[in-house]
């Protein structure tokens, strides 16, 4: 092992870390878990503890970025440099950055969580063997219903463990059809569609009708993405493999390296490569975020590279499923921080925790057997920034909400949107809303159905605000906005109509900014918005952290309450007060405990 001159290290043992943003390659829970397990490797052999916090004054700030990402050490595109970390110290020192041009996985291909089947929601195992053949993506082979499935172990033939892959034939997301699967073919604007489409939308999201006729029923959902078969490079980057496809007259129902001298797997993105010549590379094994993070955190704790090839701190990436820490790594970190106080713990497990089981539905039988009944459970939750507007018109009224523990606002982890309307705080989540009035011992009232009060709205909202003078209510969802004045509604209208370009995927919040003016937020950017003209001033575009230093860069909701600005990330808010033109964070807290006064039991 090696350390740098002067044994640079942290001088406290309770190290904090902040996950500033996420890669799209893995579910957030998997990323959180990979980082937690990587830290656990080091805490298992030292007196160090690692606590996740939600502010930039954490010791170790974790960030995904590409190319030039704000320091003097740019990333280099796919492969090559995977990540980098700074040695311990204040500011950027100690931080760990991950190149988001890589495919992040757990080292064994894209992570595709399954539903139903008999594997309790475990992720697909790629490649897997089925009937003696190797599959590197989900397949419909062995089924007559067209549902894509995968084995959750290396060999389905011997282990019999499987689950269904994300598929529009199984469920849809968001929309207004409560997660029902697509109905193919369906009619939209008089035309017949037998696959998901982006027609009628300007944001590129794929959708489908969930009944045979969208024009009549107006019921739709968004098609889940298929990470296992989204191609890279070739001439169809971002499109899906189509299985089976024809290549040189032969049919292929999985990715192949035929026709290539380099062994790289590819697929066609139409059913016939010979005629259409559309293709791309299939996802590779990716890099284990857990292993790369464990290495980078070693640097962030003060370890230099090791010259022992088997050590975690050796400078070359090597996938392993065994315990990552070598004796040399342990000696190095203990040289800096000493051993963990007795008794020695058992070494941390490095196996991936299984995702929680899906809702109980009828089992669907093994792939070779037609399921006795199509699974009926809705999706476990919409994507965090998923679209919610319909293709061309507002969705139909939502149905009544069954009672469940989530009906208590205090049990809601993250609200879709929060807004001060009148003198009350409104909190929106999945087609429901609560009202809250501040006061001793007061509790949120509700839930009420959004559809009962504002029937044109989708279930999932990104942000809401009330313009005080006109009492107009603006509801944003995906690339669309609805404006309610009393019971009458204008919309849905596309964000383009407000002067927001196609690169603005959603409006994540709004703050008052003088008479008849608002600030509209989308991710890291904001614009001045004239409520009367219902237009943004394109020249007013600015970076959020310029005007509001100290707030998270990945807030999902911004709202005003009691004359203060609240920036929400995860379950937390950053409250900003303005004094003499200076915006300063004066409080960080939990939405539930600190705003809604929920009990902390």
């Amino acid at each position: 092992f090696q350390t740098f001159e002067g044994d640079l290290k942290w001088h406290h043992h309770n190290i904090t870390y902040w996950i500033q943003n996420y890669s799209e390659d893995l579910p957030r829970a998997v990323i959180d878990d990979a980082f937690a397990r990587a830290f656990a490797l080091w805490s298992a052999v030292t007196p160090l503890t690692f606590t996740r916090v939600y502010s930039r004054d954490a010791d170790i700030v974790i960030q995904f970025g590409v190319a030039e990402h704000g320091d003097g050490y740019p990333f280099d595109g796919k492969d090559g440099l995977l990540a980098h970390a700074f040695p311990p110290g204040p500011g950027i020192q100690g931080d760990a950055h991950f190149d988001d041009d890589e495919l992040w996985s757990l080292g064994k291909g894209v992570v595709v969580p399954t539903r139903f089947g008999n594997a309790d929601g475990a992720a697909c195992h790629f490649p897997f063997i089925f009937e003696g053949r190797s599959y590197s993506a989900c397949t419909t082979d062995g089924r007559s219903d067209g549902l894509p499935w995968c084995s959750t172990t290396a060999n389905y033939d011997t282990d019999d463990r499987f689950g269904f892959c994300p598929s529009e034939r199984l469920y849809t997301q968001d929309g207004n059809a409560d997660g029902k699967p697509c109905q193919f073919p369906f009619i939209f604007q008089g035309q017949s569609y037998s696959a998901c489409t982006t027609d009628g939308r300007s944001d590129g999201y794929r959708w489908c009708a969930t009944t045979a006729n969208y024009d009549r029923d107006k019921l739709f959902g968004f098609c889940p993405t298929r990470a296992d078969s989204t191609v890279m490079g070739g001439n169809s980057a971002g499109e899906l493999c189509v299985f089976p496809f024809t290549f040189l007259g032969k049919e292929y129902s999985t990715c192949t390296s035929e026709g290539r001298g380099d062994g790289r797997l590819w697929c066609a993105t139409t059913s016939n490569f010979d005629s259409d010549k559309k293709w791309g590379f299939c996802p590779d094994q990716g890099y284990s975020l857990f292993l790369v993070a464990a290495h980078e955190f070693g640097h962030a704790l003060g370890l230099d590279h090791s010259s022992v090839p088997e050590a975690l701190m050796y400078p070359m990436y090597r996938f392993t499923e065994g315990p990552p820490l070598h004796k040399d790594d342990v000696n190095g970190i203990r040289h800096l921080y000493g051993p963990r106080p007795e008794p020695e713990p058992r070494p941390p497990t490095t196996t991936t925790p299984q995702p929680t089981a899906p809702p109980t539905v009828c089992p669907t039988g093994p792939p070779t057997v037609h399921p006795s009944e199509r699974p009926t459970a809705g999706p476990t939750g919409p994507p965090s920034a998923g679209p919610t507007g319909p293709p061309t018109a507002g969705p139909s009224t939502a149905t009544t909400v069954p009672l469940s523990p989530v009906d208590d606002a205090c049990n809601v982890n993250i609200f879709d949107a929060i807004a001060e309307i009148g003198n009350q705080l409104y909190l929106f989540k999945d087609g429901k809303y609560w009202r809250f009035s501040e006061g001793r011992g007061s509790r949120p009232q509700g839930p009420f159905l959004i559809a009962d009060k504002w029937p044109a709205l989708p279930r999932k909202l990104d942000s809401v605000f009330e313009e005080r003078l006109s009492k107009k209510l603006f509801f944003f969802s995906g690339r669309q906005v609805w404006v309610y004045t009393g019971a009458s509604v204008l919309g849905p209208r596309r964000l383009d109509k407000l002067g927001l370009g196609a690169d603005v995927a959603q409006v994540t919040g709004a703050l008052r900014s003088g008479r008849g003016k608002m600030l509209l937020f989308s991710g890291r950017r904001l614009w001045r918005f004239d409520v009367k003209a219902q237009m943004v001033d394109p020249r007013s575009a600015s970076e959020v952290d310029r005007m509001f230093p100290g707030v998270p860069l990945d807030t999902h909701d911004v709202f005003q309450y009691r004359e203060k600005a609240y920036f929400c990330q995860d379950r937390f808010y950053w409250r900003v007060s303005s004094r003499s033109e200076l915006n300063q964070v004066d409080q960080v807290g939990y939405v539930t405990y600190d705003i809604l006064q929920c009990p902390e039991d």
């Epitope: 003097g72 050490y73 990333f75 280099d76 440099l81 990540a83 980098h84 590279h305």
Partner: antibody, heavy 124, light 107 residues
């Protein structure tokens, strides 16, 4: 002992080409970012290009982008700079320099070892 | 790009005196600053990295300080071999940039 030895400089006409080499020894060459830095006669230092350990990451100063190509052969412990479409303003002593930073362990700002330099003169 | 401004352009001091060289960045670069010494006909030599760490083999009379935008290289007591040109270089943001240099000459 760490050593960097440049070669390949000389007199070339505008529009011409040259290939500089830098032979490295005394350290694990394949672990480090390597740089070319130049100094026009009587002037200050200007970075030209950097290459990351695996050779995948290459970056260039705006003044040479599209004309110069940096590369490395880790098996030979050698750094290269291919210079095409040379101009009079490219006249300088070209140094190769070893970064204190590894590819992925950063924050150690500084070039801790430099070659003796090789003079490139672009003139008609 | 971040501009690095060194002052003074020339500093005339006698052996044994204390030399203070300044380097200012056009925006904050944290502590990502290095100092180099260059003598005529020679390659630059790293003196200080990350604003305040002395490089291997550099005498203790050389010290660096500062963070953010203002940095100082101090030579506590000048020796005859210290007369040279001194450059600062930043890596707080991409691309790296050098200062224009300070010439330290014998008074």
């Amino acid at each position: 002992e760490v050593q960097l030895l440049e070669s390949g400089g000389g007199l070339v006409q505008p529009g011409g080409s040259l290939r500089l080499s830098c032979a490295a020894s005394g350290f694990t060459f394949s672990w480090y970012n390597m740089w070319w830095v130049r100094q026009a006669p009587g002037k200050g230092l200007e970075w030209v290009s950097v290459i990351y350990p695996s050779g995948g990451g290459t970056f260039y100063a705006d003044s040479v982008k599209g004309r110069f190509t940096i590369s490395r052969d880790n098996s030979k412990n050698t750094l290269y700079l291919q210079m095409n479409s040379l101009r009079a303003e490219d006249t300088a002593v070209y140094y190769c320099a070893k970064d204190r930073a590894y590819g992925d362990y950063v924050g150690w700002n500084g070039f801790d070892y430099w070659g003796q330099g090789t003079l490139v003169t672009v003139s008609s | 790009d971040i501009q690095m401004t060194q002052s003074p352009a020339t500093l005339s001091l006698s052996p044994g005196e204390r030399a203070t060289l300044s380097c200012r960045a056009s925006q904050s670069i944290s502590s990502f600053l290095a100092w180099y010494q260059q003598k005529p006909g020679q390659a630059p030599r790293l003196l200080i990295y990350d604003a305040s760490y002395r490089a291997t083999g550099i005498p203790a009379r050389f010290s660096g300080s500062g963070s953010g935008t203002d940095f100082t290289l101090t030579i506590s007591s000048l020796e005859p071999e210290d007369y040279a040109v001194y450059y600062c270089q930043q890596r707080g943001n991409w691309p790296i940039t050098f200062g224009q240099g300070t010439r330290l000459e014998i008074k």
